[in-house]
């Protein structure tokens, strides 16, 4: 049971934190702003380094209410720019295709399955 609870809670804690804090530019206080900036930087680095998107995948940004969605119209950005497939200069291979959701131009895999392997081994 404990393992099942961990499997349920861990990704959901990641998801809750990401949805609430990622690109949240209107926090109630400075401490929250500092936390939001930290979460945003961490997720940006994770998505760029591991070629992944969100916790479970790009649909996280569309399925749930989030600070990111408040800041970005869905028609403009279905998911963060860091979800786009990048070239060797770390620029989107084809930003137009990424924003339009053309397969192969954005990362389909969620980040949790990539980071949960190393976490579960400890």
């Amino acid at each position: 049971t404990a393992a099942t609870q961990q499997d349920f809670f861990t990704p959901n804690l990641f998801l809750k934190q990401m949805l609430e804090r990622y690109q949240n530019n209107s926090p109630p206080n400075n401490d929250d702003q500092w936390k939001n900036n930290g979460v945003t930087k961490t997720w940006d680095r994770l998505m760029l380094q591991d070629n992944c998107c969100g916790v479970n995948g790009p649909s996280d940004w569309q399925k749930y209410t989030s600070a990111f969605r408040t800041e970005n119209n869905d028609a403009d950005y279905p998911w963060p720019r860091q979800c786009c497939v990048m070239n060797n200069l770390k620029e989107p291979l084809n930003l137009e295709a990424c924003k339009l959701g053309v397969p192969g131009f954005y990362h389909n895999q969620g980040c949790y399955e990539l980071i949960s392997g190393p976490m579960n081994r400890h």
Partner: antibody, heavy 121, light 113 residues
Framework: QVQLQQPGAELVRPGSSVKLSCKAS????????MHWVKQRPIKGLEWIGN????????YYNQAFKDKATLTVDKSSSTAYMQLSRLTSEDSAVYYC??????????????WGQGTLVTVSA | DIVMTQSPSSLTVTAGEKVTMSCKSS????????????LTWYQQKPGQPPKLLIY???TRESGVPDRFTGSGSGTDFTLTISSVQAEDLAVYYC?????????FGSGTKLEIK
């Protein structure tokens, strides 16, 4: 039907700037990125960059990063490209172009007639 | 940047002849996400803007005569005109439509004897 209207020609002085226009009609302007392409007799076709009219986001070919500035005016469904610090190398035909369909990001299916820019003292 | 190399630079043929022109890219244009090659062919007649002929390397744009055929995958592509007509006099360009910056080949000029 889809139309991209561009002025026929612009004569400009070296060192000055010029703002080229591309007026779109026959479709929802916000739904399609606008692309700009340069053509010179020897150099052929060069892709300058593109702009998303819905939010103004741009992507530039590095070769044109300091030369071209892309903007849009949603109220008049017009895309603009400003070229700065003009030299004889900037004398060319400049086209605006749009994708063929909203779902696909590839192939430029609609083109303006092009604006001939002549840089001369 | 992806470099697009077209050959030959020009060719002169008689009406009714079969013509093939080549386009090679310095990197693969195959998108593994949808298994499509992001290679486009355009035809440009004197005094006109380029006109879309073929996209995804082999899909003919509606209204384009079936004598025009695109083929190839990855880095090697070919445009074939099965029976050249007088109105096919033009420059033909291939374009990388896969990654920024989108790049064009230098063109193949088709002349009719």
């Amino acid at each position: 039907q889809v139309q991209l209207q561009q002025p026929g020609a612009e004569l400009v002085r070296p060192g000055s700037s010029v703002k080229l226009s591309c007026k779109a009609s026959g479709y929802t302007f916000n739904s399609y990125w606008m692309h700009w392409v340069k053509q010179r007799p020897i150099k052929g076709l060069e892709w300058i960059g593109n702009i998303d009219p819905s939010d103004g986001e741009t992507y530039y070919n590095q070769a044109f990063k300091d030369k071209a500035t892309l903007t849009v005016d949603k109220s008049s469904s017009t895309a603009y490209m400003q070229l700065s610090r003009l030299t004889s190398e900037d004398s060319a035909v400049y086209y605006c172009a749009r994708r063929g369909t909203a779902q696909a990001t590839t192939w430029l299916g609609y083109w303006g007639q092009g604006t001939l820019v002549t840089v001369s003292a | 940047d992806i470099v697009m190399t077209q050959s030959p630079s020009s060719l002169t043929v008689t009406a009714g002849e079969k013509v093939t022109m080549s386009c090679k890219s310095s990197q693969s244009l195959l998108n593994s996400g949808n298994q499509k090659n992001y290679l486009t062919w355009y035809q440009q007649k004197p005094g006109q803007p380029p006109k879309l002929l073929i996209y995804w390397a082999s899909t003919r744009e509606s209204g384009v005569p079936d004598r025009f055929t695109g083929s190839g995958s990855g880095t090697d592509f070919t445009l074939t005109i099965s029976s050249v007509q007088a109105e096919d006099l033009a420059v033909y360009y291939c374009q990388n439509d896969y990654s920024y910056p989108f790049t064009f080949g230098s063109g193949t000029k088709l002349e009719i004897k």
